[in-house]
Amino acid sequence: VPLSRTVRCTCISISNQPVNPRSLEKLEIIPASQFCPRVEIIATMKKKGEKRCLNPESKAIKNLLKAVSKEMSKRSP
């Protein structure tokens, strides 16, 4: 969800910190659009429901995305 009607991109700051997939409530990958010209990855944490902006270029975050997509492919029939 954008921060407001006037601000284009949500992630003012981004994090390189590794995220434990088990601590994730939700992972949103927002593709680049006419509003925000870059991909944004927003992780909603189970604890406190805090939303974190993740660095799409970070090795740790790329590994997280791989782990999550692997988990999703296991679950899908």
Partner: antibody, heavy 120, light 108 residues
Framework: QEQLVESGGNVVQPGRSLRLSCAAS????????MHWVRQAPGKGLEWVAV????????YYADSVKDRFTVSKDNSKNTLYLQMNSLRAEDTAVYYC?????????????WGQGTMVTVSS | EIVLTQSPAILSLSPGERATLSCRAS??????LAWYQQKPGQAPRLLIY???NRATGIPARFSGSGSGTDFTLTISSLEPEDFAVYYC??????????FGGGTKVEIK
């Protein structure tokens, strides 16, 4: 430790220009968006400007729009505020502040401030 | 522009007492509200973001609550170092980001 240090404050005449700097250390500057916030003597806090972590997006308070420009040099770990056409009402302590590393807008690390006085 | 009104302007209390500070928004800001503490001659310090999340290193005696237009910062038991000015700040529908006028918590 994580630190922000502002510099460049001075006494200037109305209509003149000034550039403030904010040197960051102890954290990965290139992943943080940054703000300028000011405080007139004896008054409350006023947000001035923001710049995204990669410098792509910038927004300003109406009171400084078209006069002030925020920029960020990630290779030098430094934030800047170019202030043109200064007015008496710009007199304040100017703080640089780091945006928190969550999908929110809040200032989790502040500099000590630098005083700008606009007076003839 | 969203206007934040803080009350009371001055709160006179003794150490050990409970402090309740109010911040009211001119329109709904959802949970997009932060609280800061500022001592004389110092920069502000982030206490609470997103209405109720304590910032790193902030003691548990500080808590935030509320959503929409009415918010509260509670200090459960005032310590001597808690006497300061407190500001609320919103980020709904920004720019601009706006701050309240502040509440000064002073020693009775």
């Amino acid at each position: 430790q994580e630190q922000l240090v502002e510099s460049g404050g001075n006494v200037v005449q109305p209509g003149r220009s000034l550039r403030l700097s904010c040197a960051a250390s102890g954290f990965t500057f290139s992943t943080y968006g940054m703000h300028w916030v000011r405080q007139a003597p004896g008054k409350g806090l006023e947000w001035v400007a923001v710049i995204w972590y990669d410098g792509s997006d910038k927004y300003y308070a109406d009171s400084v729009k078209d006069r002030f420009t925020v920029s960020k040099d990630n290779s030098k770990n430094t934030l800047y505020l170019q202030m043109n056409s200064l007015r008496a009402e710009d007199t304040a302590v100017y703080y640089c502040a780091r945006n928190i590393a969550v999908a929110d807008v809040a200032f989790d690390l502040w500099g000590q401030g630098t005083m700008v006085t606009v007076s003839s | 522009e969203i206007v934040l009104t803080q009350s009371p302007a001055i709160l006179s209390l003794s150490p050990g007492e409970r402090a309740t500070l109010s911040c009211r928004a001119s329109q709904s800001v959802s949970s997009y509200l932060a609280w800061y503490q500022q001592k004389p001659g110092q920069a502000p310090r982030l206490l609470i973001y997103d209405a109720s999340n304590r910032a790193t290193g902030i003691p548990a005696r500080f808590s935030g609550s509320g959503s929409g237009t009415d918010f509260t910062l509670t200090i459960s038991s005032l310590e001597p170092e808690d006497f300061a000015v407190y500001y609320c700040q919103q980020r709904s529908n920004w720019p601009p980001l706006t701050f309240g006028g502040g509440t000064k918590v002073e020693i009775k």
